[in-house]
Interface confidence: medium
């Protein structure tokens, strides 16, 4: 009873040897065809004919401008990628029988995808934005809004935001505030000076006037008649018949010169202006 199973095992081995069971899986770098395992073609070669019981797999090298980059059973090699200059592409790495050509973009352009099938020109940053990162062959320009204190008034693929001009360092004052698109406008400190200088000038004029009035009062005799001082300034009046004469000018100059001595009460000055009008 014990011998039966042993006989079965022996017979089974014998039958298997004579009629091998078709394999369901093959080793690495092999493929199953017509119930038998054939060797795959190595990278850089294509399949010409499958193996048989008596022959090995037949492979042939890929032709010029063709490649196969894996162990394969392909009957045709793949064409190398064409780096089309019309799309802004150029060859970065020439292809071999085992590798594809690698394309990249011309300088100033970048790939539209990871596969780099076409290129586009680098994006420009509009006014109000500056270049944070200049574009590369694979990435576009990165723009950033100009922060407070900086501006960009141009559309450019490589200009950063510029800092506002410092008026103080130029001994000027800000006349117009800057924005993200415009620089500050600097100007002379006239307004500032005017606010300080004008009251001082008026103060000095007033002081001089007071001194003059005081001196005249001291110098005057009680017998002096009033009309005489008023008539004195009339001697310096400009006649109207002078060609191109402008009686207003001397009055102005006198005021700028801070010496309103001859126009104590200003009467003649006013008359002159009225006469001109």
């Amino acid at each position: 009873m014990v011998r039966l199973p042993l006989q079965c095992v022996l017979w089974g081995c014998l039958l298997t040897a004579v009629h091998p069971e078709p394999p369901t899986a093959c080793r690495e770098k092999q493929y199953l065809i017509n119930s038998q395992c054939c060797s795959l073609c190595q990278p850089g070669q294509k399949l010409v004919s499958d193996c048989t019981e008596f022959t090995e797999t037949e492979c042939l090298p890929c032709g010029e401008s063709e490649f196969l980059d894996t162990w394969n059973r392909e009957t045709h090699c793949h064409q190398h990628k064409y780096c089309d200059p019309n799309l802004g592409l150029r060859v970065q790495q020439k292809g071999t029988s085992e590798t594809d050509t690698i394309c990249t973009c011309e300088e100033g352009w970048h790939c539209t995808s990871e596969a780099c099938e076409s290129c586009v020109l680098h994006r420009s940053c509009s006014p109000g934005f500056g270049v944070k990162q200049i574009a590369t062959g694979v990435s576009d320009t990165i723009c950033e809004p100009c922060p407070v204190g900086f501006f960009s008034n141009v559309s450019s693929a490589f200009e950063k935001c510029h800092p506002w001009t410092s008026c103080e360092t130029k001994d000027l004052v800000v006349q117009q505030a800057g924005t993200n698109k415009t620089d500050v406008v600097c100007g002379p400190q006239d307004r500032l000076r005017a606010l300080v200088v004008i009251p001082i000038i008026f103060g000095i004029l007033f002081a001089i006037l007071l001194v003059l009035v005081f001196i005249k009062k001291v110098a005057k005799k009680p017998t002096n008649k009033a009309p005489h001082p008023k008539q004195e300034p009339q001697e310096i009046n400009f006649p109207d018949d002078l060609p191109g004469s402008n009686t207003a000018a001397p009055v102005q100059e006198t005021l700028h010169g801070c010496q309103p001595v001859t126009q104590e009460d200003g009467k003649e000055s006013r008359i002159s202006v009225q006469e001109r009008q």
């Epitope: 020109l121 994006r123 420009s124 509009s126 006014p127 008034n153 141009v154 559309s155 450019s156 693929a157 490589f158 200009e159």
Partner: nanobody, 116 residues
Amino acid sequence: EMQLLESGGGLVQPGGSLRLSCAASGFTFATYDMYWVRQAPGKGLEWVSKISPNGWSTYYADSVKGRFTISRDNSKNTLYLQMNSLRAEDTAVYYCAKYQTHFDYWGQGTLVTVSS
């Protein structure tokens, strides 16, 4: 109306020089990157050179580096391309172009022929 007008092209012997000009009008020239692009007979467009609005930054295609110089005069609204050591392969129609996200304005082009 926006316009770009190229001039300065012509026939020149290999090794010779030419200076191309591009007069711009109808837009704020001084605030844009400007480009020179060329198209050789029977070929596609090739980017040649570009310049920043203030003229401080310039870029060149590998094929023209060291031989071509791009410049601009914003007071005259004019773009220039100084081409030295010209070769037969530089034969093409040269265009100046204004660019932001695409080439939105082109000139009519000026033909440069390098031949002995």
